[in-house]
Interface confidence: medium
Amino acid sequence: EAHKSEIAHRYNDLGEQHFKGLVLIAFSQYLQKCSYDEHAKLVQEVTDFAKTCVADESAANCDKSLHTLFGDKLCAIPNLRENYGELADCCTKQEPERNECFLQHKDDNPSLPPFERPEAEAMCTSFKENPTTFMGHYLHEVARRHPYFYAPELLYYAEQYNEILTQCCAEADKESCLTPKLDGVKEKALVSSVRQRMKCSSMQKFGERAFKAWAVARLSQTFPNADFAEITKLATDLTKVNKECCHGDLLECADDRAELAKYMCENQATISSKLQTCCDKPLLKKAHCLSEVEHDTMPADLPAIAADFVEDQEVCKNYAEAKDVFLGTFLYEYSRRHPDYSVSLLLRLAKKYEATLEKCCAEANPPACYGTVLAEFQPLVEEPKNLVKTNCDLYEKLGEYGFQNAILVRYTQKAPQVSTPTLVEAARNLGRVGTKCCTLPEDQRLPCVEDYLSAILNRVCLLHEKTPVSEHVTKCCSGSLVERRPCFSALTVDETYVPKEFKAETFTFHSDICTLPEKEKQIKKQTALAELVKHKPKATAEQLKTVMDDFAQFLDTCCKAADKDTCFSTEGPNLVTRCKDALA
């Protein structure tokens, strides 16, 4: 239904607190360099304006679109060109081109310092002084570093943050209460960020259709008792919500997400028996809970998939009559039977099925041609199953840090031209899959591993797109999203790469490394490891292990020494010499 004033409609639907939070996220995601105070001022102006429109929808400018209102605000910021360069050119365009232009200028890797968490005491003081401003800073800092973060979900994480601070700031030992809890929220939020970025990439590169296919598979796995029409409706609505968030329409996105949650809770009987716990929660928690609700129990009497999709004599007729519905039904039926498969795998199987029908339905004897299609799925299923087994075995043997190092070596060999910081970030993220997924029950490992890896590799592709340096990476990133992970897995040592010269300064360390937190120490060591591989791409695992063990021993010795500086300056060059010899 059309509203006279879109901004008044959204303000009324969302309420002031969520409205302000979402506008702050939107501005922070568009203009990532502006300070919190600059954005907070704009948010207040927009909120005041929204209130005038609530009071009188016919007031001046209240009928303007949200893109027009928000874009005008952003374009009125002083020194836009000095701070943002060519992004300022967007302001010469009309809507909807202006918004498209803003979207194209979102930076997935902004040059902002890492988000440092203040000391517990300081945090609690500023939180108690002004909780609203404190949470505003959180939204601003996360949103500007993650310009595609799913906005309603960021409000949920802010709410979690708020609850943790409220609880822990009342404790005597604030630090030990806050640290593990906030680390947990941070970890979940980072995973949420890469997953959502993947969804936006899917939407941007391959359109709504690709995202909808993803949604049908995912929803069918989670709600195997819902019929195809119900899954289709949920997939359509979910696609709309994600399209809006990916497109910067955050108020519409949050509003429609709330509507979808309401619909699901009102229609539990036709969707799933597992929703009640989620539906008892308040809005943000409810929507979050629904997004990761456990799979419903699969119906016991499901017929074999072959009946309708292989043995039926009218397969080609049904396919030609309505390809997308027939393939959608196939994806639905296959996915609801396989909660143990990743969505990526299910989409690859559907693609294989489609290709088989395209070929076979134009031949003289279609049933004979497509009769073996399910058997042809076998290698496609075995490949990720083997990947999970191999990698989880390796993780269990090496632990997270060792597993990250193994991945770092592997990926540096596959794409040695990629910058070392990008390789280290990617390997550390990919390596976390072990902790995240390998401890799960057998039937949950594959979906966890592959869908997580796909999301991380999507970030690798986004970073590489900005400055393409590796043909290997370009090749894997330009294919379809579901083929990326198998493509990266299949890459071998890049034979075209000319090894880097050995530079002693790359492997020279100083005593300041001793006082770094464990995570930073690991990053330093992993940076050295990547550089070693770039110097000797064909070094054996044994050679690299020898060098890294020597390096760890050197750090341990010097960091325990009375005179650390002397130890580093005398033992450092010896270490470099030993490294060169070991790799010769």
Partner: antibody, heavy 117, light 109 residues
């Protein structure tokens, strides 16, 4: 190149029968549905129904059920639209079109049928 | 029975202007919507299928959007050859039946 070529203009009297054709070339005739669409003078497009060439299974829009018949001849890759007893209200241009993944492309050039006493 | 309503009935614009054509369905129809262009004396030509995908050979100035019940065809900058009648077409979910909107005429102002 995929082509649908329709038979020429027809002028008929009420009560007469008529069969118009749509010859397909450039793709496997048995792999796609063929639809028929009516356009009365100065009016919009109306979907009449469609036929599946391999076994001549026909689907009719409720408005056209019993009024027309679809058929095919696989040996010459041709689809037909037939009337047993024409009415003046059947005056229109009739198009055949290939159903391709949920939409129609390409279309025949159209056959004008005029029914007048 | 599903009804498709196109608006406006006629759109009078000059070359270079942006044309926005609307198609509203009486019930949610997923994204099974196509847009066709028809010039006088010619057969319709497919422009957009599945709401937002351009058909082969269709210029980038034509774009489709929407889902559920509301769909839009946009011609970003009208060329002289774009003045014609535009039809939206819907497909029901299952079993498939097709419906056309009544058409929008785009005239030269």
């Amino acid at each position: 190149e995929v082509q649908l070529v329709q038979s020429g203009t027809e002028v008929k009297k009420p009560g007469e029968s008529l069969k118009i054709s749509c010859k397909i070339s450039g793709y496997s005739f048995t792999a796609y549905w063929i639809a028929w669409v009516r356009q009365m003078p100065g009016k919009g497009l109306e979907w009449m129904g469609m036929i599946w060439p391999p076994d001549a299974d026909a689907r009719y829009s409720p408005s056209f059920q019993g009024q027309v018949t679809f058929s095919v001849d696989k040996s010459i890759s041709t689809a037909y639209l037939q009337w047993h007893s024409l009415k003046t209200s059947d005056t229109a241009v009739y198009y055949c079109a290939r159903l391709y993944s949920g939409s129609y492309s390409p279309w025949g050039q159209g056959t004008l049928v005029t029914v007048s006493s | 029975e599903l009804v498709l309503t196109q608006s406006p009935g006629t759109l009078s614009l000059s070359p270079g202007e942006r044309a926005t054509l609307s198609c509203r369905a009486s019930q949610s129809i997923f994204n099974y919507v196509a847009w066709y262009q028809q010039k006088p004396g010619q057969a319709p030509r497919l422009l957009i299928y599945d709401a937002s995908n351009r058909a082969t050979g269709i210029p980038a100035r034509f774009s489709g959007s929407g889902s559920g019940t509301d769909f839009t065809l946009t011609i970003s900058s009208l060329e002289p050859e774009d003045f014609a009648v535009y039809y939206c077409q819907q497909r029901s979910k299952w079993p498939p039946t097709w419906t056309f909107g009544q058409g929008t005429r785009v005239d030269i102002k």
